[in-house]
Interface confidence: medium
């Protein structure tokens, strides 16, 4: 007789979740020599331990601490790239600019990127049918708490000039409710971070507005300034051109710097 299982509003755990996490861990540690000491079995055990047998609406950051400890990694100063609502471009950028890192370029972010997972109270099973939805069910679910935990840590360890890529096509270019707005902004350490530089990515080809003057950007500037961190903003009018120039900085059309505008 199949056991009764809690029905949540969100989609269930990604199929082959354990295999995917382990394969990603192996792949990551192979490609990043500085992480070769990491034992992927221990990483999986710690990941599993954070949510298996636990009520999936009562997960805490504490649950993920063993995993965070195993995945400890540092980014060189000036090399952290945060992003909000523009993940694909941020990742395309760090794939070209190999010395800059998003959270998903780090082990823990890489392991969990685009995956969903949850367990159930008092069983060792993974729930492949449904998982809690952040809005409809609860915010303290395994996936949301994971990203909150690792995002906090990522921001806390950043140093130098930190960059953030923001989506200029959205009504709220800076959204206080995003992970960047609610977690990362508040965990940048003024003792280590001299400045936050926002790159506002334009969507339309003919869009020549100065989105650095957007009210939400001004709000971000205010929050950052109050934390004793300097704020800069650049418009990236042509993201395609921007990536092209990152790939080929010597290209004559890139030398003029016309692909973005500075605002302090």
């Amino acid at each position: 007789v199949p056991r009764w299982r809690q029905q949540w509003s969100g989609s269930g755990t990604t199929s082959r979740f354990p295999e995917t996490v382990l394969a990603r861990c192996v792949k990551y540690t192979e490609v990043h020599p500085e992480m070769r000491h990491v034992d992927c079995q221990s990483v999986w055990d710690a990941f599993k331990g954070a949510f298996i047998s636990k009520y999936p609406c009562n997960i805490t950051e504490e649950d993920y601490q063993p995993l965070v400890k195993l995945g400890t990694q540092t980014v060189p100063c000036n090399k952290t790239l945060l992003w909000s609502r523009i993940k694909d471009l941020a990742h395309q950028f760090t794939q070209v600019q190999r010395d800059m890192f998003t959270l998903e370029d780090m082990l823990l972010g890489y392991l969990a990127d685009d995956l969903t997972w949850c367990g159930e109270f008092n069983t060792f099973e993974i729930n492949y049918q449904s998982c809690p939805d952040w809005r409809k069910d609860c915010s303290n679910n395994p996936v949301s708490v994971f990203w909150k935990t690792v995002s906090r840590r990522f921001a806390e360890t950043a140093c130098g000039v930190v960059h953030v890529m923001l989506n200029g096509s959205r009504s709220k270019i800076f959204d206080k409710n995003s992970t960047f707005g609610s977690v990362e902004v508040h965990n940048l350490q003024p003792e280590k971070v001299q400045a936050l530089e926002a790159w506002v990515i334009h969507g339309g080809r003919e869009d020549s507005r100065d989105l650095c003057q957007d009210p939400t950007i001004k709000e971000l500037e205010s929050i950052i300034s109050k934390r004793n961190i300097r704020f800069f903003c650049k418009n990236i009018y042509r993201p395609d051109k921007f990536l092209q120039c990152v790939k080929n900085p010597e290209d004559s059309s890139c030398l003029s710097g016309i692909h973005h505008h500075h605002h302090h």
């Epitope: 082959r16 295999e19 192996v26 992927c40």
Partner: antibody, heavy 120, light 107 residues
Framework: QVQLVQSGAEVKKPGSSVKVSCKAS????????ISWVRQAPGQGLEWMGR????????NYAQKFQGRVTITADESTSTAYMELSSLRSEDTAVYYC?????????????WGQGTLVTVSS | EIVMTQSPATLSVSPGERATLSCRAS??????LAWYQQKPGQAPRLLIY???TRATGIPARFSGSGSGTEFTLTISSLQSEDFAVYYC?????????FGQGTKVEIK
């Protein structure tokens, strides 16, 4: 007790192919990385490549690129190494080996080896 | 690829004595180095990984040290079962590569 059991010795003609199997028992197969290492008579060890069974991801040493194919069948917990265009210098014992835990860099568990003789 | 060079090629030691085997990498491999023991007709056996961590079941007389390009395997007091060929292997860069081996024989 985790074991890797390899297929038996093979005698092959130059120019032909050989496919060696490696069956894992006593552990979760799909999430362990399997490497293949060979050893010519009286010579040292030579790493050929590896596979992650759960994804099929492979990585090969440049020397064997284009001649070696490493695969894995999760349903039978078996990894395979196929070497084509055989020449006499390919005469060697071929080992499959598994990393400690889920990591493939150091090889903690080895198969018994399969002697492949290439001779006309 | 990274070339691993072991020395000496052969080491003659009396039982109970200390044996020191060297392994040099052509470029830094950090601490991503393993040591194996192989006896005639047998598969290699993992002794050390991470340059200095003993594998499960390996006696304390085996110890590894070094990082970067210079590594050492020390057998503090050779037992009769330790006479074998020893290989170092780096797993810092593709492809993983082995040294040519050091044969430890009875003096």
């Amino acid at each position: 007790q985790v074991q890797l059991v390899q297929s038996g010795a093979e005698v092959k003609k130059p120019g032909s192919s050989v496919k060696v199997s490696c069956k894992a028992s006593g552990g979760e197969f799909s999430i362990y990385v399997i490497s293949w290492v060979r050893q010519a008579p009286g010579q040292g060890l030579e790493w050929m490549g590896r596979v992650i069974p759960s994804t099929g991801d492979t990585n090969y040493a440049q020397k064997f690129q284009g001649r070696v194919t490493i695969t894995a069948d999760e349903s039978t917990s078996t990894a395979y190494m196929e070497l084509s265009s055989l020449r006499s210098e390919d005469t060697a014992v071929y080992y499959c080996a598994r990393g400690k835990a889920y990591y493939s860099g150091w090889l903690a568990i080895w198969g018994q080896g399969t002697l492949v003789t290439v001779s006309s | 690829e990274i070339v691993m060079t072991q020395s000496p090629a052969t080491l003659s030691v009396s039982p109970g004595e200390r044996a020191t085997l060297s392994c040099r990498a052509s470029q830094s491999v950090s601490s991503n180095l393993a040591w194996y023991q192989q006896k005639p007709g047998q598969a290699p056996r993992l002794l050390i990984y991470g340059a200095s961590t003993r594998a499960t079941g390996i006696p304390a007389r085996f110890s590894g040290s070094g990082s970067g390009t210079e590594f050492t395997l020390t057998i503090s007091s050779l037992q009769s079962e330790d006479f074998a060929v020893y290989y170092c292997q780096q797993y810092n860069n593709w492809p993983w590569t082995f040294g040519q081996g050091t044969k430890v024989e009875i003096k």
